[in-house]
Amino acid sequence: GSVKVLHEPSCFSDYISTSVCQWKMDHPTNCSAELRLSYQLDFMGSENHTCVPENREDSVCVCSMPIDDAVEADVYQLDLWAGQQLLWSGSFQPSKHVKPRTPGNLTVHPNISHTWLLMWTNPYPTENHLHSELTYMVNVSNDNDPEDFKVYNVTYMGPTLRLAASTLKSGASYSARVRAWAQTYNSTWSDWSPSTTWLNYYEPWEQHL
């Protein structure tokens, strides 16, 4: 039967080394066996490159394309093929479709004055444009109470958040995760980092009386 694309490719770039495109076929498809995504930078002399997609679900395909350190002017021509049949053709400008890398190494440390210090790493090297552009969202949730969660926006440069222990329930186990976005690039949010868990052993002042 004929091969058709149900949802055309949607692509995002981490703006350093990789662009990822995802699309949905109209029926379950062995993406790596049946499809190829070709991509070529719109730049004099550029070669055509081929990405072999993988299955994310039965009919969802995903392709990870290694790209050079992106610059604003870069535009790629994309062509989705099923053998000799061109299923879809489009262009993709990485600088206009940024999804930052996931922040790493989230840790929680007890700090002075009954505070917790949450720290994570900026996923970009200092020389990359995005290094100084990231802001973060930290989600802190009670492992045993879905209603007890807080969201913190970290808009300053350092990848840290100080959290007063008194704002959390004493004796409860909490998990935190962090994600990033780049405002000047109008990016989407990165994926959430893996969670880190700790016990909030802060003793309310009233219990001392």
Partner: antibody, heavy 125, light 112 residues
Framework: EVQLVESGGDLVKPGGSLRLSCVAS????????MTWVRQAPGKGLQWVSL????????YYADAVKGRFTISRDNAKNTLYLQMNSLRAEDTAVYYC??????????????????WGQGTLVTVSS | DIVMTQTPLSLSVSPGETASISCRSS???????????LDWYLQKPGQSPQGLIY???KRASGVPDRFSGSGSGTDFTLRISRVEANDTGVYYC?????????FGQGTKLEIK
């Protein structure tokens, strides 16, 4: 040592055809785009055509489009320029030159970093 | 198409002096920060052209540091300091950004 040697230049009548060759050595030929540039007697340099490393993409000056064809044989480290429907104004020394490295996603640019010695094409009746 | 305009078309300089050649493009040659696709070439009498400067300011291999390129966008300059008799020839700028590639008309440098 990186070297380019052109051949094939000759005296040809208007409307005639000629094929120029450029044999490369001393570098990984398939990794680089190649360019032809010409120079009419007593005139400046004029770009003619470019082909990327794989041979999959070609570019031409308007003055030669539809008449000239650039190609390459990476197994033989050789660049070609097939010239048809030649005109008097095509009379020039034709140089081949090594252009950008196209093996990477975004071509790495070093300018036209090596040139051949040139071959003379004369179109006259 | 991008048009390249060089000035002056001829230049006469005494040995040891500095020669400056200007090149202007009809469109910006800046692709990304630090990447101006503008080259300079020298063609000595009876020889093939040779690369001097690429990407606006990077010296080609083996080119003496007396040769320097500067500029960005549409305005570029080649400077040759401490000019020597061996520097005589025709200097060309070329844009390598987009097809069709294009050269300036050339500047003939004569050493007095």
């Amino acid at each position: 040592e990186v070297q380019l040697v052109e051949s094939g230049g000759d005296l040809v009548k208007p409307g005639g055809s000629l094929r120029l060759s450029c044999v490369a050595s001393g570098f990984t030929f398939r990794d680089y785009a190649m360019t032809w540039v010409r120079q009419a007697p007593g005139k400046g340099l004029q770009w003619v055509s470019l082909i990327n490393g794989s041979g999959g993409k070609t570019y031409y000056a308007d003055a030669v489009k539809g008449r000239f064809t650039i190609s390459r044989d990476n197994a033989k480290n050789t660049l070609y320029l097939q010239m048809n429907s030649l005109r008097a104004e095509d009379t020039a020394v034709y140089y081949c030159a090594v252009d950008r490295k196209t093996k990477t996603i975004r071509p790495q640019y070093y300018g036209l970093w090596v040139w051949g010695q040139g071959t003379l094409v004369t179109v006259s009746s | 198409d991008i048009v390249m305009t060089q000035t002056p078309l001829s230049l006469s300089v005494s040995p040891g002096e500095t020669a400056s050649i200007s090149c202007r493009s009809s469109q910006s040659l800046l692709y990304s920060i630090g990447y101006n696709y503008l080259d300079w070439y020298l063609q000595k009498p009876g020889q093939s052209p040779q690369g001097l400067i690429y990407l606006g300011s990077k010296r080609a291999s083996g080119v003496p540091d007396r040769f320097s390129g500067s500029g960005s966008g549409t305005d570029f300059t080649l400077r040759i300091s401490r000019v020597e008799a061996n520097d005589t020839g025709v200097y060309y700028c070329m844009q390598g950004l987009q097809s069709p590639l294009s050269f300036g008309q050339g500047t003939k440098l004569e050493i007095k």
